[in-house]
């Protein structure tokens, strides 16, 4: 099924060569004697059989219906029929954009990370033998490249590479010149790979508390989707019934990273909770980052410099 037209809904631009190739072509060669027919229906017209006399712009081959070129009135449904095999297409021919070298409906967008490999290759396998020359345009300005048969860009992407790249193939058929345009919208973005996760705020935090009261220690981090954030405290986590890890909260940042926070709730604070390390760690494939909290009795606040306190 080499280069057959498999998608049932096709939009093309007026004035360009175009073809429909059915997807049982190899089968058609095997049964040369079988009757093969192409039909068109549009609006009030029902199943009109196509033949070379239908229009000087239409050419019929074994597997292919060619338009030289396709025009607005070619819009409609097309059928290929051979024995009990039928293939149907819905063709929509749209107006060419007179103010640009391409039509926006016919754009393929690609997003490329800066410094990553980026390529544009101007190829058209079906019309290859008929193509005289091919030009590559960036934002409708012609690029001067060495190869005028298959112009190619292969490089590591830079932000300046962003833009609309149009491959224009020029070809002759029956003494007339035609062109076919293929346009790529290339957007260059910052490296989307993983960040080194980081815990927000000071690495050591003294928290002033009162015995018998409750406290919530909030640990926040900027991390990747697969990174984890957890609390470590005491000899064995979970040995103190008054200490609870709350459910982790995550919000996605506009850059696609995550802002996560995990609260450690200590209820009915006792002497055993004072002056011990409550460690919060963020772990990723790239390493870990830890910050510590120490509970200090409010009465002892005067002994510690003010800048190390967290409320």
């Amino acid at each position: 099924a080499e280069s057959c037209t498999s998608r049932p809904h096709i939009t093309v631009v007026e004035g360009e060569p175009f073809y429909l190739k059915h997807c049982s072509c190899s089968l058609a060669h095997e049964i040369e004697t079988t009757t093969k027919s192409w039909y068109k229906s549009s609006g009030s017209q029902e199943h009109v059989e196509l033949n070379p006399r239908s229009s000087s712009r239409i050419a019929l081959h074994d597997c292919v219906l060619e338009f030289w070129p396709v025009e607005l009135n070619d819009t409609g449904s097309y059928f290929f029929q051979m024995k009990n095999y039928t293939q149907k297409w819905k063709l929509n021919v749209i107006r060419r954009n007179k103010h640009s070298c391409f039509t926006e409906r016919q754009v393929t967008s690609k997003i490329v990370e800066v410094k990553k490999f980026f390529q544009i290759t101007c190829e058209n396998s079906y019309y290859q033998t008929l193509v005289n020359s091919t030009s590559l345009y960036k934002n409708c300005k012609k690029l001067l490249l060495e190869n005028n048969k298959n112009p190619t860009i292969k490089k590591n992407a830079e932000f300046e590479d962003q833009g609309y790249y149009s491959c224009v193939h020029f070809l002759h058929h029956n003494g007339k010149l035609f062109n076919i345009t293929k346009t790529f919208n290339i957007t260059i973005v910052e490296d989307r790979s993983n960040i080194v996760p980081v815990l927000l705020g000071p690495k050591l935090n003294h928290v002033a508390v009162e015995l018998g009261k409750n406290v919530r220690l909030n640990c926040s981090a900027l991390l990747n989707e697969e990174d984890v954030i957890y609390w470590m405290f005491g000899e064995e986590n979970g040995s103190d019934p008054n200490i609870h890890e709350e459910k982790e909260m995550r919000i996605m940042t506009p850059e696609g990273k995550w802002h996560a926070s995990k609260v450690l709730r200590i209820e009915n604070i006792g002497e055993s909770n004072l002056n011990v390390l409550y460690n919060c760690t963020v772990a990723s494939t790239g390493g870990t980052d830890t910050k510590s909290f120490i509970l200090v009795r409010k009465a002892d606040m005067a002994d510690i410099p003010g800048h190390v306190f967290t409320r």
């Epitope: 099924a1 057959c4 998608r7 809904h9 039509t103 409906r105 754009v107 393929t108 690609k110 919208n185």
Partner: antibody, heavy 121, light 111 residues
Framework: QVQLVQSGAEVKKPGASVKVSCKAS????????MHWVRQAPGQGLEWMGT????????YYAQKFQGRVTMTRDTSISTAYMELSRLRSDDTAVYYC??????????????WGQGTTVTVSS | EIVLTQSPGTLSLSPGERATLSCRAS??????????MHWYQQKPGQAPRLLIY???NLETGIPDRFSGSGSGTDFTLTISRLEPEDFAVYYC?????????FGQGTKLEIK
């Protein structure tokens, strides 16, 4: 006619990787983009990323960046999706599906039958 | 990233009634007269099925009781007269830009 046939169900342990294949037939493999969409039990559809088989261009949803790899073998018209560092919430049905390459044509008219991936210790 | 929000989450109707499902995009998905919004139907244990492409075009083989409308950020899928087989989950999807995205779905259930 156009068909996508996916590999069979997989059961994996957390931290492991899974590679799902999708064999295309009935059309020119390099002319359509291949996408991967997953659906966790009782949840909605989640687009994971895409590959253009003509030049191996890939684009992944940010959520899967760094964990997913999409590849293709044009000689056998097959696309692959590998997801690494599996977690229990990766348990889902994974679908391959095709679209045209123009932005306007990136809708999914042909789907694979789905591959169930279960992540459990 | 374009976020699609579908409403309602669940719609309870009877066969024969008219269903109106909504999909709102966080930014416009329309350009040069085309709207890059598509609709799917999914039944339990099955892959999704394309219903409408480019906001209003009916996919081949889909009954004409299904129709799509809208432009810019607001889109609607309408089922004119519900048949028993129409009760399923419906998703909208945009292709205006990468990453592609789906709405969270609307469950259409029998009242």
């Amino acid at each position: 006619q156009v068909q996508l046939v996916q590999s069979g169900a997989e059961v994996k342990k957390p931290g492991a990787s899974v590679k799902v294949s999708c064999k295309a037939s009935g059309y020119t493999f390099t002319s359509n983009w291949m996408h991967w969409v997953r659906q966790a039990p009782g949840q909605g559809l989640e687009w994971m990323g895409t590959i253009d088989p003509s030049d191996s261009y890939t684009y992944y949803a940010q959520k899967f960046q760094g964990r997913v790899t999409m590849t293709r073998d044009t000689s056998i018209s097959t696309a692959y999706m590998e997801l690494s560092r599996l977690r229990s919430d990766d348990t889902a049905v994974y679908y391959c599906t095709t679209s045209g390459d123009y932005d306007a044509d990136r809708y999914f008219d042909v789907w694979g039958q789905g591959t169930t991936v279960t992540v459990s210790s | 990233e374009i976020v699609l929000t579908q409403s309602p989450g669940t719609l309870s109707l009877s066969p024969g009634e008219r269903a109106t499902l909504s999909c709102r995009a966080s930014k416009s998905v329309s350009t040069s007269g085309d709207s890059y919004m598509h609709w799917y139907q999914q039944k339990p244990g099955q892959a999704p099925r394309l219903l409408i492409y480019l906001a209003s075009n009916l996919e081949t083989g889909i009954p004409d009781r299904f129709s799509g409308s809208g432009s810019g950020t607001d889109f609607t899928l309408t089922i004119s007269r519900l048949e028993p087989e129409d009760f399923a989950v419906y998703y909208c999807q945009q292709s205006r830009e990468l990453p592609l995205s789906f709405g969270q779905g609307t469950k259409l259930e029998i009242k």
